[in-house]
């Protein structure tokens, strides 16, 4: 019955079983509802808007990493509908802390104004 179906399942009245909601492809996100036993008849997948990406499945589109604005890094690969942006080396005037574990966002560049003496990215 409906209540037994999981987060991404709908109740198929023909088979009397819970069935997996159709997953979206890379670069798309679900539109309208499917899950916990019900499925909208017009349920489908829409493309990710500009500056967002999705790997597909039931994932909503997420914003690309802001390499320059947030990480103060160069853009190695710009993101598209299917892939996140990849950040490269720090922007001029910024450096990366050595031996610092990556945080949840990856590596963050810091201003040379805060750099220890002789930091290679900040010399000259």
């Amino acid at each position: 019955e409906y209540s037994n179906c999981g987060e991404n399942e709908y109740y198929n009245q023909t088979t009397g079983l819970c069935q997996e909601c159709p997953p979206c492809g890379p670069g798309e996100e679900p539109y309208l509802s499917c899950g916990y036993g019900t499925k909208d008849e017009d349920y489908g997948c829409v493309p990710c808007p500009a500056e967002k990406f999705s790997k597909g499945g039931y994932q909503i589109c997420r914003r690309h990493k802001d390499c320059e604005g947030f990480f103060r890094a160069t853009v190695l690969t710009p993101g598209d509908m299917e892939n996140d942006a990849e950040c490269g080396p720090c922007l001029p005037g910024y450096y990366m802390l050595e031996n610092r574990p990556r945080n949840i966002y990856g590596m963050v560049c810091y201003s040379c104004l805060l750099a220890p003496p002789n930091t290679k990215e900040c010399v000259g």
Partner: antibody, heavy 119, light 107 residues
Framework: EVPLEESGGGLVKPGGSRKLSCAAS????????MHWVRQAPEKGLEWVAY????????YYADTVKGRFTISRDNAKSTLFLQMTSLRSEDTAMYYC????????????WGAGTTVTVSS | DIQMTQSTSSLSASLGDRVTISCRAS??????LNWYQQRPDGTVKLLIY???RSQSGVPSRFSGSGSGTDYSLTISNLEQEDVATYFC?????????FGGGTKLEIK
């Protein structure tokens, strides 16, 4: 085999009625939402109406609301458009078009049937 | 309703040319933009869906791009069989709307 074939077009007097049909073949009709789209002579395409696979969702363009009725018979793999109170501006080629599963565009179109509203 | 504008109603190009047809939406349609080809005999065919994805069986010379409100269809190596009218269509919200069409002819 043509997947979508419209019929029922012809000459109708203003204020008259007409019922168009669209016969589907070569695919599981009951899995697909279906649309009617029209094109007036020397004009662009205009979306007219949509019906979901199981008929639970039906939508119309404002220009036809209250005068046209979209319906379907999944057992006979046929889509219909009942047109009433016809006006000269309804003169057009009427196409039925299939909505791709899970997507929001028309992936297969019929060849169209012409409706002419004139006295 | 979302208005779709194809600023060029007709254009003429030579065989082998690269042709770009543009389409503008009255508001952001989040890449939910599709392109159709209507041949002179009236037959309509889907070419590109969701801005840049090619429908199966469509020649690789057809490509799409854009984002937000501005989109384009490019034919990279014009062939005789490409003589047709091209329509953009937004599938973001009902009522679905189409551009006025761009009629492509060979010089």
């Amino acid at each position: 085999e043509v997947p979508l074939e419209e019929s029922g077009g012809g000459l109708v007097k203003p204020g008259g009625s007409r019922k168009l049909s669209c016969a589907a073949s070569g695919f599981t009709f009951s899995d697909y939402g279906m649309h009617w789209v029209r094109q007036a002579p020397e004009k662009g395409l205009e979306w007219v109406a949509y019906i979901s696979s199981g008929s639970s969702a039906i939508y119309y363009a404002d220009t036809v609301k209250g005068r046209f009725t979209i319906s379907r018979d999944n057992a006979k793999s046929t889509l219909f458009l009942q047109m009433t109170s016809l006006r000269s501006e309804d003169t057009a080629m009427y196409y039925c078009a299939r909505r791709e599963i899970l997507r929001y565009y028309f992936d297969v179109w019929g060849a169209g049937t012409t409706v002419t509203v004139s006295s | 309703d979302i208005q779709m504008t194809q600023s060029t109603s007709s254009l003429s190009a030579s065989l082998g040319d690269r042709v770009t047809i543009s389409c503008r939406a009255s508001q952001d349609i989040s890449n939910n933009l599709n392109w159709y080809q209507q041949r002179p005999d009236g037959t309509v065919k889907l070419l590109i869906y969701y801005t840049s994805r090619s429908q199966s069986g469509v020649p690789s010379r057809f490509s799409g791009s854009g984002s937000g409100t501005d989109y384009s269809l490019t034919i990279s190596n014009l062939e005789q069989e490409d003589v047709a009218t091209y329509f953009c269509h937004q599938g973001k919200t009902l009522p679905y709307t189409f551009g006025g069409g761009t009629k492509l002819e060979i010089k």
